[in-house]
């Protein structure tokens, strides 16, 4: 028996479903009665999901994985891992046994995508050339953590004073708050990319200071 | 008629290393899984070790893992399994089984290994 | 790990006699459980395999019943060459393959 998964990771939206493919090639006249399955957390090799004697043994992992009961028969022992949390990343093992034994393991690659930016200035008043303000951009949610990009009006980085904090959640989500500290010219605009790195997501915010009013 | 012969057991120091080998005839070897099973002397029978037919993919007992490597040569139906660092817990009859399903249909005599300072 | 249990450690019994053979396993194993003899001195020998389904060779006096956590191997009459240690083995989790400790049949 040869078992075949995806050689890429599964990327997977959290609180969605994902689908782990684990694919064998049952021998002609093959009955489930002849199939042991077992799917564990390839580190850790915690039981995930298992099938044996010809029943689904059921969820091991927090009764939300389930088989594909009419596809089994045809070789697929795909994994359904339904409302997809943070913990859940990492690498899964397929275990495909009928006489001889197999198996493969596929990673699982969980994803959020950031906010909207928003955009605060300190101070946010009295404002002139030449001063030094301090300019918040702040993205909430996502997963895994951010890239953070700041570039002035002409498109050019701004790398320099550059602070940026990312802050996870009780849900393993990340806030990132990234404060830039400019000198301010006659006027400008200052914009802020929070990118994510699995999504390849861009989130942009910015601010354009003119005098006054300030324009966000 | 199916054959288990395996060899390569004697006696080492601990923390040395020995490589046992199975001789297989008789079955269709690429396709069945193949197994150790150890057997300490007065005592009860241990799983060491399995590999898939293709040699793919190897299973290990917590007890060896990381010490033992076990592997499969097809063009000559030979099972092998290398111990280094080996202890005096690991003196022991090695026996090479066929595996159907999980459970071991053919079982060789064994080879001896002791490991004694 | 799946846990398994022989009782008793011994069983002396006289030829013809009917003999008893326990097996427990410490959480559900369903019907995936093996067993085997071994005579001194020999390798072990495959008798029954799925709890009750005897191995290619084996006489009809050997069988094995139950399900789930308890396990028995009847031997119905004993013969001179059934006095061996018999040992099960789970493989209901077949990545950490168990076997029991054993139960000897000696000779009264």
């Known amino acids: 028996v040869e078992v075949q998964v995806s050689e890429d990771p599964v990327v997977a939206l959290v609180d969605t479903d994902a689908t782990l493919r684990c694919s064998f090639s049952p021998e002609p006249g093959f009955s489930l009665a002849q199939l042991n399955l077992i799917w564990q957390l390839t580190d850790t090799k915690q039981l995930v999901h298992s099938f044996t004697e010809g029943r689904d043994q059921g969820s091991a992992y927090s009764n939300r994985t389930a088989l594909f009961p009419d596809l089994l028969v045809q070789g697929n022992a795909s994994l359904r891992l339904q409302r997809v949390r943070v913990t859940d990343e990492g690498s899964y093992t397929c275990f495909v046994s009928i006489q001889d034994f197999d198996s493969a393991a596929v990673s699982l690659q969980v994803a959020a995508p950031y906010s909207k930016p928003s955009m605060t200035l300190e101070p946010n008043k009295d404002l002139r050339p030449g001063n030094m303000v301090t300019i918040t951009c702040s993205s909430y949610q996502g997963y895994p953590e951010a890239e953070v990009f700041w570039k002035d009006g002409q498109g050019v980085p701004l790398t320099g004073n550059v602070t940026t904090s990312q802050m996870a959640n009780e849900r393993g989500l990340f806030d990132v708050h990234s404060v830039l500290r400019v000198v301010l010219g006659a006027n400008g605009t200052y914009s802020c990319l929070v990118r994510n790195p699995v999504l390849q997501q861009d989130a942009h915010g910015s601010v354009t200071i003119t005098g006054q009013p300030l324009t966000f | 008629d199916v054959q288990l012969v395996e060899s390569g057991g004697g006696v080492v120091r601990p923390g040395e290393s020995l490589r046992l080998s199975c001789a297989a005839s008789g079955f269709t070897f690429s396709s069945y899984a193949m197994s150790w099973v150890r057997q300490a002397p007065g005592e009860g029978l241990e799983w060491v070790s399995s590999?898939?037919?293709?040699?793919?993919?190897?299973l290990y007992a917590d007890s060896v893992k990381g010490r033992f490597t076990i592997s499969r040569d097809s063009s000559n139906n030979s099972l092998y399994l290398q111990m280094n660092s080996l202890r005096a817990e690991d003196t022991a009859v090695y026996y090479c089984?066929?595996?159907?399903?999980?459970?071991?249909?053919?079982w060789g005599l064994g080879t001896l290994v002791t490991v004694s300072s | 790990e799946i846990v398994l249990t022989q009782s008793p450690g011994t069983l002396t019994l006289s030829p013809g006699e009917r003999a008893t053979l326990s097996c427990r396993a410490s959480r559900s194993i369903l019907t995936s459980l093996a067993w085997y003899q071994q005579r001194p001195g020999q390798a072990p020998r495959l008798l029954i395999y799925g709890a009750n389904s005897r191995a290619t060779g084996i006489p009809d006096r050997f069988s094995g019943s139950g399900s789930g956590t308890e396990f028995t191997l009847t031997i119905s009459s004993l013969q001179s060459e059934d006095f061996a240690v018999y040992y099960c083995q789970q493989y209901y989790d077949w990545l950490t393959i168990t076997f029991g400790g054993g139960t000897k049949v000696e000779i009264k």
């Open positions: 590999i898939s037919g293709s040699g793919g993919s190897t």
């Open positions: 089984a066929k595996a159907r399903n999980n459970f071991f249909d053919y």
